[in-house]
């Protein structure tokens, strides 16, 4: 969480931004709110990266203004008109990239004053893992795939009964790259499981940390998965029996944007 | 409500021009993408392009650049396709869309009603 | 450019069955595939953006899925309305780009 207060002339607002990453090929949030104002033509919004010469995005009397926009953003950026009268500056992003990694500014003018503060944006691919028992091997094996990681992940089994246990001697981790060359598929088998045990399968990489657990009993199989972006107030949870999903804005394009 | 309301059908002959427009109401017209389409007959659907009206700024399918030219007018909400140096095979019926998502270009959510292009000598 | 490959070009099926159309991406990956639907003489109807989601008022038996290169839309119990043409739309690049369409015919 970043705040930041404007420094120039006599009146400053706070301004609120919260680290994030971006799923390549997906929409992205840049998080920013401020100190609202009752009048919508008095807001300006500008959006600045880091090494970039043209804007990113502004928004300025009620609506958007992108003659100052740098090439590698037009067609990509959009405000939430409908939120900025109430403090939120937040920027929607489509199709992250790699290279939109980087250092941005959410610079705000209001009839209050002037304040902005950076966010950094990382970005790569994550996505939530499967743990499922694998009858096909000759033993009593699971399987846990996840199909989107970049870059590449580590991945560590651990149990509920043999806590603190090594499975690196059991376990079998492969990554695959995917058809456009940049994201890998990542499978980990691991071997000699034991009924009644709950196993968690987590891969975790410089972005994000996902965890799938698999449940086996003698009646029925119950699933798990969480994933958790790394500096940033964003989770979400998937249950094969009860299924909840929440979202700070870092995390809401893969819930519900377009 | 959204609605694009287009210019009505021409016949031209090989190597003329055409321009269709496109009326938009019901919306902010500089915050959206406009885009173009066109279906020739018994075919399916191919993409030419699109502006920004807030600022003017196009993307053009490669098979057509050099020989159309998207613009608009903001006074009159206005979008505009040109196409020149017609051959038969631009026969067709146009369609401008709006593409939602405001200055991010999204998919595209409106259409026109289109407009017929006959190309024949 | 990026191509989208869509099949099959036609199919036929009856009132009541679960009819599967596929688009795969010549390269890239993203999200952003859309589905629209079109009758004789009329314009394309968007139904699915952004791989999965449902545009408003479209019926809950269409439903989108996909990853990668590879994208599906399903209609899980054909209804005598949507006999009709359908397409795919790529709209993640600068460059937008439709699959060739499938005529879903009545059997």
């Known amino acids: 969480l970043i705040i930041g207060f404007g420094i120039s002339g006599r009146h400053s607002i706070t301004v609120t931004t919260v680290a994030s990453a971006g799923n390549i090929g997906e929409d992205g949030i840049l998080s920013c709110t401020f100190e609202p104002d009752i009048k919508l033509s008095d807001i300006v919004i500008q959006w600045l990266k880091e090494g970039v010469i043209g804007l990113v995005h502004e928004f300025k009397e009620g609506k958007d203004e992108l003659s100052e926009q740098d090439e590698m953003f037009r067609g990509r950026t959009a405000v939430f008109a409908d939120q900025v009268i109430v403090g939120n500056a937040s920027l929607r992003l489509k199709n992250v990239q790699l290279t939109d990694a980087g250092t941005y500014k959410c610079y705000i003018i209001t009839s209050k004053g002037k304040g902005n503060a950076n966010l950094e944006y990382k970005t790569g691919a994550f996505s939530m893992p499967e743990v499922n028992v694998d009858y096909n091997a000759s033993s009593e094996t699971l399987r846990c795939e996840a199909p989107r990681w970049f870059p590449q992940p580590t991945v560590v089994w651990a149990s509920q009964v043999d806590q603190g246990a090594n499975f690196s001697e059991v376990s079998n981790t492969s990554f695959e790259l995917n058809s456009e060359n940049v994201t890998m598929k990542v499978v980990s088998v691991l071997y000699n499981v034991t009924i009644n045990n709950t196993y968690s399968c987590m891969i975790e990489n410089d972005i994000a940390k996902a965890t799938g657990d698999i449940k086996v009993t003698e009646s029925e199989i119950k699933r798990r998965s969480h994933l958790q972006l790394l500096n940033s107030k964003a989770s979400l949870c998937v249950s094969s029996f009860l299924a909840i999903s929440w979202a700070l804005l870092p995390l809401a394009p893969y819930l519900m944007l377009k | 409500e959204v609605q694009l309301v287009q210019s009505g059908a021409e016949v031209k002959k090989p190597g003329a021009s055409v321009k269709v427009s496109c009326k938009a109401s019901?919306?902010?017209?500089?915050?959206?993408?406009i885009g173009w389409v066109r279906q020739a007959p018994g075919q399916g659907l191919e993409w030419i392009g699109d502006i920004y009206p807030g600022g003017g700024y196009t993307n053009y399918n490669e098979k057509f650049k050099g020989r159309v030219t998207i613009t608009r007018d903001t006074s009159t909400s206005t979008a505009y396709l040109e196409l020149s140096s017609l051959r038969s095979e631009d026969t067709a019926v146009y369609y401008c869309a709006r593409l939602d998502g405001s200055s991010y270009r999204g998919a595209m959510d409106s259409w026109g009603q289109g407009t017929l292009v006959t190309v024949s000598s | 450019d990026i191509q989208m490959t869509q099949s099959p070009s036609s199919l036929s099926a009856s009132v009541g069955d679960r009819v599967t159309i596929t688009c795969k991406a010549s390269q890239g990956f993203n999200k952003y595939v859309a589905w629209y639907q079109q009758k004789p003489g009329k314009a394309p109807k968007l139904l699915i953006y952004y791989t999965s989601t449902l545009q408003p008022g479209v019926p809950s038996r269409f439903s989108g899925s996909g990853s990668g290169r590879d994208y599906t839309l399903t209609i899980s119990s054909l209804q005598p309305e949507d006999f009709a043409t359908y397409y795919c739309?790529?709209?993640?690049?600068?460059?937008?780009?439709f699959g060739q369409g499938t005529k879903v015919e009545i059997k």
């Open positions: 019901g919306y902010t017209f500089t915050s959206y993408w």
């Open positions: 739309l790529q709209y993640g690049n600068l460059l937008y780009a």
